[in-house]
Interface confidence: low
């Protein structure tokens, strides 16, 4: 996905504006691509990404990718179409309102990814196991 902040301003200088909130209107996501991160050994982290973007396509959701190797930790925040794989993985949790990190198998690094479908939901990434789809409270939030 082309970073949508290149194409569309998200400040008050827009000619007109966004979201009466109708179905499949483009999502608002944090979109800083890959940046170094200090997020480590925490139940949850903020992205520290200052760019909120209107996703380029109405079907796109918010995605965050946390990676740790011997040298550094990075956090990637983007919009992405859940019908397409990202980093070779399917976005299984795209309908979730919260970005619940799940570990994926990648050689030579620790790799977590999450996706979600509420505005700026990839700003707060959650690693804690208490948040999962067997949690009735989370299901209530998703399907209310």
């Amino acid at each position: 996905t082309i970073p949508p902040h290149v194409q569309k301003s998200v400040n008050n200088d827009m000619i007109v504006t966004d979201n009466n909130g109708a179905v499949k209107f483009p999502q608002l996501c944090k979109f800083c691509d890959v940046r170094f991160s200090t997020c480590d050994n925490q139940k949850s982290c903020m992205s520290n990404c200052s760019i909120t973007s209107i996703c380029e396509k109405p079907q796109e959701v918010c995605v965050a990718v946390w990676r740790k190797n011997d040298e550094n930790i990075t956090l990637e925040t983007v919009c992405h179409d859940p019908k397409l794989p990202y980093h070779d993985f399917i976005l299984e949790d795209a309908a979730s309102p919260k970005c619940i990190m799940k570990e994926k198998k990648k050689p030579g690094e620790t790799f977590f990814m999450c996706s979600c479908s509420s505005d700026e939901c990839n700003d707060n990434i959650i690693f804690s196991e208490e948040y999962n789809t067997s949690n009735p409270d989370l299901l209530l939030v998703i399907f209310q």
Partner: antibody
Framework: EVQLVESGGGLVQPGGSLRLSCAAS????????MTWVRQAPGKGLEWVSV????????YYADSVKGRFTISRDNSKNTLYLQMNSLRAEDTAVYYC???????????????WGQGTLVTVSS | DIQMTQSPSSLSASVGDRVTITCRAS??????LNWYQQKPGKAPKLLIY???SLQSGVPSRFSGSGSGTDFTLTISSLQPEDFATYYC?????????FGQGTKVEIK
């Protein structure tokens, strides 16, 4: 049960100011973008403004840009619309509405308040 | 801005009638169209989203169809509580825009 209750409407002179509030209950307020939509007497619906769940991103219709300010207090589950430099053409019922969060699941502006009337007249 | 044009602007019908309201967009909006019902003195109510999906709790006599620029709201058998004004709204591009409304009155 989802409820949205607007308040703060009334009669104001041209050039004056008014602050509308919308108290929300029955849902997780801070993950929903919230909008204001207005309807002039006997007329159709006009979208006014939206604010993202965190409050970090806001947008306005051309007709109100620079005069209206949308904000929210997530600790109080309340949405606001500060209206300055009011004009006669701003006279309308103002509705706050919840943006349907899950674009493939729910969609649409699915819950609306009952509206509050703003009358701008000398 | 995308212009939304509804027709007719008003219609008279009887209980039990099949009623059809059309909405035309000034450019293609795929299936990103919603229908709302509004009764006098009340807030709008979402009926149909994504052109043809029925919102939870809405009676099955309401249905929507169409794609691209031409859309239809159909009430298969008009009930007394259906006399109201109906609005279409596109959600394809900014700003979201509404049609001018169709008032359904008792014949």
């Amino acid at each position: 049960e989802v409820q949205l209750v607007e308040s703060g409407g009334g009669l104001v002179q041209p050039g004056g100011s008014l602050r509308l509030s919308c108290a929300a209950s029955g849902f997780t307020f801070d993950i929903y973008a919230m909008t204001w939509v207005r309807q002039a007497p006997g007329k159709g619906l006009e979208w006014v403004s939206v604010i993202s769940g965190s409050g970090g991103t806001v947008y306005y219709a051309d007709s109100v840009k620079g005069r209206f300010t949308i904000s929210r207090d997530n600790s109080k589950n309340t949405l606001y619309l500060q209206m300055n430099s009011l004009r006669a053409e701003d006279t309308a019922v103002y509705y706050c509405a919840r943006r349907g969060q899950y674009r493939d699941i729910a969609g649409g502006t699915d819950y609306w308040g009952q509206g509050t009337l703003v009358t701008v007249s000398s | 801005d995308i212009q939304m044009t509804q027709s007719p602007s008003s219609l008279s019908a009887s209980v039990g009638d099949r009623v059809t309201i059309t909405c035309r967009a000034s450019q293609s909006i795929s299936s990103y169209l919603n229908w709302y019902q509004q009764k006098p003195g009340k807030a709008p109510k979402l009926l149909i989203y994504a052109a043809s999906s029925l919102q939870s709790g809405v009676p099955s006599r309401f249905s929507g169809s169409g794609s691209g620029t031409d859309f239809t709201l159909t009430i298969s058998s008009l009930q007394p509580e259906d006399f109201a004004t109906y609005y279409c709204q596109q959600s394809y591009s900014t700003p979201p825009t509404f049609g001018q409304g169709t008032k359904v009155e008792i014949k």
